[in-house]
Interface confidence: low
């Protein structure tokens, strides 16, 4: 008599999470009499997946009617597959007895579950940095299977190369996670720039998934300061302007000092945006020359985004000015830079 064969034709089956998996098994002979059972894994710790005779297996159904006479097809269908169902499934023939005796096992079918990666989440640095500094962005995506995946970083359409990527865990798992860090060198023009993390995987049958971060959250563009004087007015008042240009973010406090004493403090708000995303702001101070005997040292002090103050000073020469009305002599700009931190 020819030896019984248990045939599992597929070495492996790959199924998308949520779909059904069909595991095929046929036997070459109806004898000896005895049941077929399905297990996941081999050895003493194997897990019973399906037993026609007894037990409750709500997600497992036989493909053909196993009670039919002369049935030699013991294929099963497992519904609503999840990554936890991955593993090698064995179709095992038993000889009828008390108890039934294991006679022959199929070669096994490895079920791999294709699970989509989650949408990539990109996070940037906790604190802002200025141009020419390097900042790191992190991208994470979870829950995918199989392990093979690729991740690319872009800044304004250009692929970044200073990237470090890890897929965890290193060994076999029902699903995997990817974490990647990209280092980006900032420029003053990056307020409108964007970094994109792009993840592609077998389960993504079209475009890869993308996560984005705006460099506006990571960059600080320090201001340029310039203090200038308009010509003296007829009422002996000098109009001095402090121009604060090309800064980002908008959070900025400006203080005027007259001979070291605080004259006025202003906060920037609702400023129009430059094309490159930065802001400009101009503040004026009227100085009554006739109220001063000596030269007046004016200082425009700017605190930007919580950084140390930047000062620009300017001396108005009052000793040379006659006190009568109509004097129109220009003041002298000493342009002293008390502290200029960029």
């Amino acid at each position: 008599e020819e030896e019984l064969q248990v045939i599992q034709p597929e070495k492996s089956v790959s199924v998308a999470a949520g779909d059904s998996a069909t595991l095929n098994c046929t036997v070459s002979s109806l004898i000896p009499v005895g049941p077929i059972q399905w297990f996941r894994g081999a050895g003493p710790g194997r897990e019973l997946i399906y037993n026609l005779k007894e037990g409750h297996f709500p997600r497992v159904t036989p493909v053909s009617d196993p009670t039919k006479r002369n049935n030699m097809d013991f294929s099963i269908r497992i519904s609503n597959i999840t990554p936890a169902d991955a593993g090698t499934y064995y179709c095992v023939k038993f000889r009828k007895g008390s108890p039934d005796v294991e006679l022959k096992s199929g070669a096994g079918t490895e079920l791999s579950v294709r699970a989509k990666p989650s949408a990539p989440v990109v996070s940037g640095p906790a604190v802002r940095a200025t141009a020419e500094h390097t900042v790191s962005f992190t991208c994470e995506s979870h829950g995918f299977s199989p392990r093979d995946i690729t991740l690319k970083w872009f800044k304004n359409g250009n692929e970044l190369s200073d990237v470090q990527t890890n897929v965890d865990p290193a060994g076999k798992s029902v699903s995997y996670s990817i974490r990647s860090t990209a280092r980006v060198v900032l420029t003053r023009r990056d307020v409108h720039s964007q970094v994109i993390c792009e993840v592609a995987h077998v389960t993504l049958q079209g475009d890869p998934l993308r996560g984005t971060a705006n460099l506006s959250e990571a960059i600080r563009v320090p201001p340029f300061l310039e203090v200038t004087q308009q010509s003296m007015r007829a009422d002996n008042q000098v109009n001095v302007t402090c121009q604060v240009t090309k800064f980002y973010p908008q959070r900025l406090q400006l203080t005027w000092l007259e001979n070291g004493n605080v004259s006025r403090t202003e906060m920037a708000s609702a400023l129009p945006e430059n094309k490159d995303g930065t802001y400009n702001w101009t503040s004026w101070l009227l100085v009554n020359v006739s109220a001063h005997r000596d030269d007046v040292k004016l200082t425009c002090q700017v605190e930007h985004d919580g950084q140390p103050a930047v000062n620009k000073s300017f001396s108005v020469k009052v000793s040379a000015h006659p006190k009568e009305q109509g004097s129109n002599t220009a003041a002298e700009n000493t342009g002293t830079n008390e502290r200029n931190i960029y």
């Epitope: 077998v202 049958q205 079209g206």
Partner: antibody, heavy 123, light 107 residues
């Protein structure tokens, strides 16, 4: 580095068949789909279809069903294009081209191209 | 099938010129559009995918824009090595289709 190396030029008689190979180097063949593109002399590019290198399943464009067969031999990291019952109008350069997306098997944009194989059909 | 129409079919320009090639799809292809460069007797070279993304190693003078049905490839300052034929390709819908090509020649 990544490269697709195709077999050399072929001169065939009408009615014969030809098999063009495309060997993948620098990456795993089964990780990226492989497309085939035809360029007749002096003409533009024409997409013939692609093979899902993960499952081996081919997809053919409308004009390339029947005489054209895409296949794989993963043991030698090679994709093949076989054309049967050759006609004079099959004279063209045939390119293999890798789909850009990792495991992106729906055709897509191509990131790497083979150098091309000229197939000439003449009696 | 989606028809891809490039204009102009040919173009003469000088080194240093700014050149724009347009590609129009007969129906919406989203951003599933790629650009390729081909020199005589050579295989095509991949320049741009997803309408705007340059492949690594592609000079920054090449840029892509557009979505839906209208796309452009711009070369900001032509270099001697840029004289070639350029093809657009949509990969939104089967069959994947190419434009007829734009031949960029030296003036």
């Amino acid at each position: 580095q990544i490269q697709l190396v195709q077999s050399g030029s072929e001169l065939k008689k009408p009615g014969a068949s030809v098999k063009v190979s495309c060997r993948a180097g620098g990456y795993t063949l089964t990780d990226y789909a492989m497309n085939w593109v035809r360029q007749a002399p002096g003409q533009g590019l024409e997409w013939m279809g692609f093979i899902n290198t993960y499952t081996g399943e081919p997809t053919y464009a409308q004009g390339f069903k029947g005489r054209f067969v895409f296949s794989l031999d993963t043991s030698v990291s090679t994709a093949y294009l076989q054309i049967g019952s050759l006609k004079a109008e099959d004279t063209a350069v045939y390119y293999c081209a890798r789909t850009r997306g990792y495991y992106d098997f729906d055709g897509g944009a191509f990131d790497y191209w083979g150098q091309g194989t000229l197939v000439t059909v003449s009696s | 099938d989606i028809q891809m129409t490039q204009s102009p079919s040919s173009l003469s320009a000088s080194v240093g010129d700014r050149v724009t090639i347009t590609c129009r799809a007969s129906q919406n292809v989203g951003t599933h559009l790629a650009w390729y460069q081909q020199k005589p007797g050579k295989a095509p070279k991949s320049l741009i995918y997803s309408a705007i993304y340059r492949y690594i190693g592609v000079p920054s003078r090449f840029s892509g824009s557009g979505s839906g049905t209208d796309f452009t490839l711009t070369i900001s300052s032509l270099q001697p090595e840029d004289f070639a034929t350029y093809y657009c390709q949509q990969y939104n819908t089967y069959p994947l289709t190419f434009g007829q090509g734009t031949k960029l020649e030296i003036k």
